[in-house]
Interface confidence: low
Amino acid sequence: NQDLPVIKCVLINHKNNDSSVGKSSSYPMVSESPEDLGCALRPQSSGTVYEAAAVEVDVSASITLQVLVDAPGNISCLWVFKHSSLNCQPHFDLQNRGVVSMVILKMTETQAGEYLLFIQSEATNYTILFTVSIRNTLLYTLRRPYFRKMENQDALVCISESVPEPIVEWVLCDSQGESCKEESPAVVKKEEKVLHELFGTDIRCCARNELGRECTRLFTIDLNQTPQTTLPQLFLKVGEPLWIRCKAVHVNHGFGLTWELENKALEEGNYFEMSTYSTNRTMIRILFAFVSSVARNDTGYYTCSSSKHPSQSALVTIVEKGFINATNSSEDYEIDQYEEFCFSVRFKAYPQIRCTWTFSRKSFPCEQKGLDNGYSISKFCNHKHQPGEYIFHAENDDAQFTKMFTLNIRRKPQVLAEASASQASCFSDGYPLPSWTWKKCSDKSPNCTEEITEGVWNRKANRKVFGQWVSSSTLNMSEAIKGFLVKCCAYNSLGTSCETILLNSPGPFPFIQDN
């Protein structure tokens, strides 16, 4: 049919942090290159029906379905989803094509289904069908890796029972502390399941698939390092494998290592030793203690002893279920407008947590850092001095934890005024919450010093906008003040701010800001 317009259907995927996308804006913010959905004419259908390629979306993803129409003249349109009509606002791009968009924010099951777009142009009417479904990741899993000894070899196998099968990599580092951060030049990555080089300072195994990345560190006691002030602690759940490595370096091979649990030697078959000469001809020995599936009675102090080094211990605690230990009482903070400040949560958890910081319905990435005492800490500094409620949420396989923070920013009040026929009201969001005064301006009091106390009603903290308190004061109008100028002033420890209002008969009220 020669009259049929040229139709292009595209899918725009928005990055998760794209908070600028509106509910069904005609001008969505493009975050990634649009994907062509084809839009072919559907054969054997009554009327002109175009069908876009099916769209599969991850849960919580944000997308835009967009149609570009190359047809002369104006177009009008209507979206229909699950028998409900949705607003449709076409606009024209630089090439004079009609553009119609449907934005779906944070995809959920309820938003999956058929979206019908009816378009009426001067030449013809036609329908465009989009089918949107949620990508089925229910069967997908990503489990933390664990270690096994390779049969008949001095090597460790890293296993992550995940679907789809993850890519497994060993992350090795031979220097101390900060320089073993993931992107440091001291870090070497080996994408294989078996590791033979087990003498390094820091050994981790990571598994990654479509769901993300999980890592497990090989717990190590280094007899050449000064012991930590608090005893290192290792948590495991019943049934998980236990691996502890004891490492020691000496000038020659004349030393041995042994493992004890609560002063009793570990049973044969629960340890194996390896040794090598380092570049400077010193001898490195490592002794692994392992239990293929731990039980409650494997809890206790594991001590590695050497004939040439002071012994060191670690406390292994076997738990039935994972946990997150932290104080969940809410915390309030009061800071100056330019003061540097970070929220922080100190916690002990097993398995490792996944966490987010949330403010004003927006989520922020959460970083966690291990402390020497077995605790971890997460800090959030990106508050940009916005007052309100901040939420820290953490979870692992077995536990959830939420902690609330309120941030108050100390500042001088800012006053806004409004008036009606019967009253005048002033609002302020300064902090600490301001006190109010009302003054009358008259011939007797040209400087507005005559205080009004009758008919004043103060409401402190009457509404909470994401934790931000607003204070208000209302003056009921009496005959004594009708027709006069009145001044409302809000003051706190940081200053005063006033507004002047003319109380005349009903109608628009002039306000004079007066700081």
């Epitope: 789809p164 099968e165 890519i167 497994v168 994408e191 294989e192 399941k193 078996v194």
Partner: nanobody, 111 residues
């Protein structure tokens, strides 16, 4: 270095069957899991099935019952048996071991 080669694709009528093969070179075959994926025109690559080194199998729920994954470690080959094929099964099918992918084999199901 692992190299993978899929074969067995082709044109088949709806309701028919095909058996895809994934031949691997390299010594790591028996130690690793094998995944099959597929990619239909204009769509993202999607996971189909998996077989672990121990022979345990997992399937995309909507395909379970029609597709069967198996492996023969002696031949360094994995298989995907596809029965009761539908037009929506039309795609390029790929196998994967670790981070290694094959070139893919085209399966077209006509109605």
């Amino acid at each position: 270095q692992v190299q993978l080669q899929e074969s067995g694709g082709g044109l088949v009528q709806a309701g028919g069957s095909l058996r895809l093969s994934c031949a691997a070179s390299g010594s790591t075959f028996s130690r690793n899991y094998i995944d099959w994926y597929r990619q239909a025109p204009g769509k993202q690559r999607e996971w189909v099935a998996q077989i672990t080194s121990g022979g345990n199998t997992h399937y995309e729920p909507s395909l379970k019952g029609r597709f069967t994954i198996s492996r023969d470690n002696a031949k360094n080959t994995a298989y995907l048996q596809m029965n009761s094929l539908k037009p929506e099964d039309t795609a390029v099918y790929y196998c994967r071991i670790l981070d290694y992918w094959g070139q893919g084999t085209q399966v077209t199901v006509s109605s």
